[in-house]
């Protein structure tokens, strides 16, 4: 019989008034030996499912069921996956701010709309929180001495059009 709880291994508990290492009871764990009690194992139920089962030395780990995501340290809460037009923040699902969009279900971040003018294109369809803008064809700006080559679909030849 030992005289101290100091030598107890994880997976056991020990009482100072009766210093013997005892195995943790079912559904409990102790990651540090020599503690006066073992801790109740976490149960993953409802919106949670087991990611890792409880052992005598480690608590269970939970994750969220399909269609939900974890919030908080050690996945303390499950929240419905974000819809298109939202992104996941520490505070939960937040609607994309003006000028940004997310077209993915459950994942992804809000990304800025495409800047059509950078490609020399016009905006054909304005963006929403769920969809990017649709850019039109390149804008033709007629300036002096611009040469446009036109190649008819049918043949290899082309006509040159000089704009004065």
């Amino acid at each position: 019989v030992q005289n101290s709880c100091d030598n107890c291994q994880p997976g056991t508990f020990c009482r100072k008034y009766n210093p013997v290492c005892k195995s943790c009871p079912p559904s409990t764990f102790s990651s540090i030996g020599g503690q006066p009690n073992c801790n109740i194992c976490r149960v993953c139920a409802g919106y949670f499912r087991f990611k890792k089962f409880c052992s005598s030395t480690h608590n269970a780990e939970c994750e969220c069921i399909e269609g939900f995501h974890c919030l908080g340290p050690q996945c303390t809460r499950c929240e419905k996956d974000c819809r298109p037009g939202q992104e996941l923040t520490k505070q939960g699902c937040k609607t994309c701010s003006l000028g940004t969009f997310n077209d993915q279900n459950g994942t992804g971040v809000c990304r800025p709309w495409t800047n059509c003018s950078l490609d020399g294109r016009s905006v054909l369809k304005t963006g929403t929180t769920e969809k990017d803008v649709v850019c039109g064809p390149p804008v033709v700006s007629f300036s002096p001495s611009t040469t446009i080559s036109v190649t008819p679909e049918g043949g290899p030849g082309g006509h040159s059009l000089q704009v004065l």
Partner: antibody
Framework: EMQLVESGGGLVQPGRSMKLSCAGS????????VAWVRQAPKKGLEWVAY????????YYRESVKGRFTISRDNAKSTLYLQMDSLRSEDTATYYC?????????????????WGPGTMVTVSS | DIQMTQSPSLLSASVGDRVTLNCRTS??????LAWYQQKLGEAPKLLIY???SLQAGIPSRFSGSGSGTDFTLTISSLQPEDVATYFC????????FGAGTNLELK
């Protein structure tokens, strides 16, 4: 030396109140779930009330619910049992005991450390 | 509530005898059963927990066995200081004690 000592017992009239105390010394009583177990004269044992180590959870046997209150003062390493509306059938030796199960649990208790007990007699 | 039946209620035996005390529960309690010894004028003392685990400091002549609904406390060689009342207790569902077996010397 590690010990539990009950006090506060005695003779009380039916319908009156009494408060029992249990002092732990030589170890940290606040680390453990603690229960009161009683034994009527020449009879068997029955648990009366239980309180978890931090005091957040309490359980009572059906016959004392609403009349008895278990509490603890961890700073003083003391456990209490407030007994109101006492009946003759509450006459017993009341023992303060530590839950040996080791699981911070509700209801799975065996008792591996006992005080010597204090006698409560309810009689007119 | 789970009912506990201890038998016999009174047992007379001689020093050196092998003594067997029985405890039966009305429902399956698996191995959630403890045995206590109570000497006259004293508080009970835990002997066995989890049906067969010997509490530290208890002499090895005491042993527990059983699982489910039928349990046994055995004293391999009775000593004069073993004269006492022995209680079983289930802690699977709530807590209930048996009425006790009074062990005396012949």
């Amino acid at each position: 030396e590690m010990q539990l000592v009950e006090s506060g017992g005695g003779l009380v009239q039916p319908g009156r109140s009494m408060k029992l105390s249990c002092a732990g010394s030589g170890f940290t009583l606040s680390d453990y779930g603690v229960a009161w177990v009683r034994q009527a004269p020449k009879k068997g044992l029955e648990w009366v009330a239980y309180i978890s180590y931090a005091g957040g959870t309490t359980y009572y046997r059906e016959s004392v619910k609403g009349r008895f209150t278990i509490s603890r003062d961890n700073a003083k390493s003391t456990l209490y049992l407030q007994m109101d509306s006492l009946r003759s059938e509450d006459t017993a030796t009341y023992y303060c005991t530590i839950d040996g199960y080791g699981g911070y649990s509700g209801s799975h208790w065996y008792f591996d450390f006992w005080g010597p007990g204090t006698m409560v007699t309810v009689s007119s | 509530d789970i009912q506990m039946t201890q038998s016999p209620s009174l047992l007379s035996a001689s020093v050196g005898d092998r003594v067997t005390l029985n405890c039966r529960t009305s429902q399956n309690v698996y191995k959630n059963l403890a045995w206590y010894q109570q000497k006259l004028g004293e508080a009970p003392k835990l002997l066995i927990y989890n049906a067969n685990s010997l509490q530290a400091g208890i002499p090895s002549r005491f042993s527990g066995s059983g699982s489910g609904t039928d349990f046994t406390l055995t004293i391999s060689s009775l000593q004069p200081e073993d004269v006492a009342t022995y209680f079983c207790q289930q802690y699977y569902s709530g807590n209930t004690f048996g009425a006790g077996t009074n062990l005396e010397l012949k």
